[in-house]
Amino acid sequence: LIIGFGISGRHSITVTTVASAGNIGEDGILSCTFEPDIKLSDIVIQWLKEGVIGLVHEFKEGKDELSEQDEMFRGRTAVFADQVIVGNASLRLKNVQLTDAGTYKCYIITSKGKGNANLEYKTGAFSMPEVNVDYNASSETLRCEAPRWFPQPTVVWASQVDQGANFSEVSNTSFELNSENVTMKVVSVLYNVTINNTYSCMIENDIAKATGDIKVTESEIKRRSHLQLLNSKAS
């Protein structure tokens, strides 16, 4: 969490941002909140990006003002116009690109004063893994697949029964470049699995960590997966 203040004493307002991550090719949100004002027409929101000459987005007098918007953000940004009055300056960003990563500034002017806060935005690719029993294999084998990751993640297998065991000798992981030549499909195979055990396939890079669990018994197979973004810090 980053909390920024205006420069001059009583004419400063609090602006709060949260560091976040964007999934390339998907839509993202850059979070920013501020002390609200009574009149929408008195609020100015400017989003800026370090190293970019034009603005990322500008909202003033109750509407967007895109005359100074940088070409790389054309047609890709929006604020939640109906929520500005309650202090939400968050930015919706369409079709996140690797090049969108960097330091952003949320700069606010209201009748109470000015304030700003920076936000670190990471970009990459992350997706939920799915673990299945590979019935085509000669021995009991599990196959963990996740369609889109970048940068290249690490893959670690774990088991509920054999806690702390190292499965690197009995697993094989491959990375296949997707058609857009950036993200990769992750496939990891675990051999010699036993029934009545829960196995976890953990995929992690510096942006996200995802886990796919599978419990195999003689009567059923249960699956569960979850994904967590790393380093979401507020400012």
Partner: antibody, heavy 120, light 107 residues
């Protein structure tokens, strides 16, 4: 409510320049949250996005037409214009102007469209 | 550019029946998709944006769903005024592109 109206010649000779103007009424072309776009539809076919312009004059064109397209805006007249050079019979279409959301980038409302035929 | 493919090209439905129109993108467009209705001699009219958000004034019988590459426009109970051509449009990346259209005709 906002209305758009295309105007311009209905017949253009091959190799010449097609020129159309869209007049916006019931609202200002300076509406900051919108671009102003052109879309065309050849007879009996689908829709093709030509490009858009912001009230400040910044433009974005469809790469397939970029070398031949020029758009301009006249805020004092609440109008924006399209020029398409070196036309051929393949450019025969109904040309629509429309308001385009800055994001989400929908088109609404549209002008009623004007048929431009390219023929000698 | 992203290619949008609509199916079927023609859909024959009786009034009061349900119509399901499909739109497929050549690559993921997230939920950055709009649907339009066009009647003969008229300009298209926006029905749905962001894949599922219905425009103010559009009847509730029109609904959109989907994300990524597969999208659906559903008309729950066709009225006589709904027989028209329907187009999907992606605005995920430039250039914006439209599908070839689905004509909904009276059976």
């Amino acid at each position: 409510q906002l209305q758009l109206q295309e105007s311009g010649p209905g017949l253009v000779k091959p190799s010449e320049t097609l020129s159309l103007t869209c007049t916006v009424s019931g609202g200002s072309i300076k509406s900051g949250s919108h671009y102003w776009g052109w879309i065309r539809q050849p007879p009996g076919k689908g829709l093709e996005w030509i490009g858009n312009i912001y009230y400040s004059g910044s433009t974005y064109y469809n790469p397939s037409l970029k070398s031949r397209v020029t758009m301009s805006v006249d805020t004092s007249k609440n109008q924006f214009s399209l020029k398409l050079s070196s036309v051929t019979a393949a450019d025969t279409a109904v040309y629509y102007c429309a308001r385009e959301g800055s994001y989400p980038n929908w088109f609404d409302p549209w002008g009623q469209g004007t048929l431009v035929t390219v023929s000698s | 550019e992203i290619v949008m493919t609509q199916s079927p090209a023609t859909l024959s439905v009786s009034p009061g029946e349900r119509a399901t129109l499909s739109c497929r993108a050549s690559q993921s467009v997230s939920t950055n998709l709009a649907w339009y209705q066009q009647k003969p001699g008229q300009a298209p009219r926006l029905l749905i944006y962001d894949a599922s958000a219905r425009v103010t004034g559009i009847p509730a019988r029109f609904s959109g769903s989907g994300s990524g590459t597969e999208f659906t426009l559903t008309i729950s109970s066709l009225q006589s005024e709904d027989f028209a051509v329907y187009y999907c449009q992606q605005y995920h990346s430039f250039p914006f592109t439209f599908g070839g259209g689905t004509k909904v005709e009276i059976k």
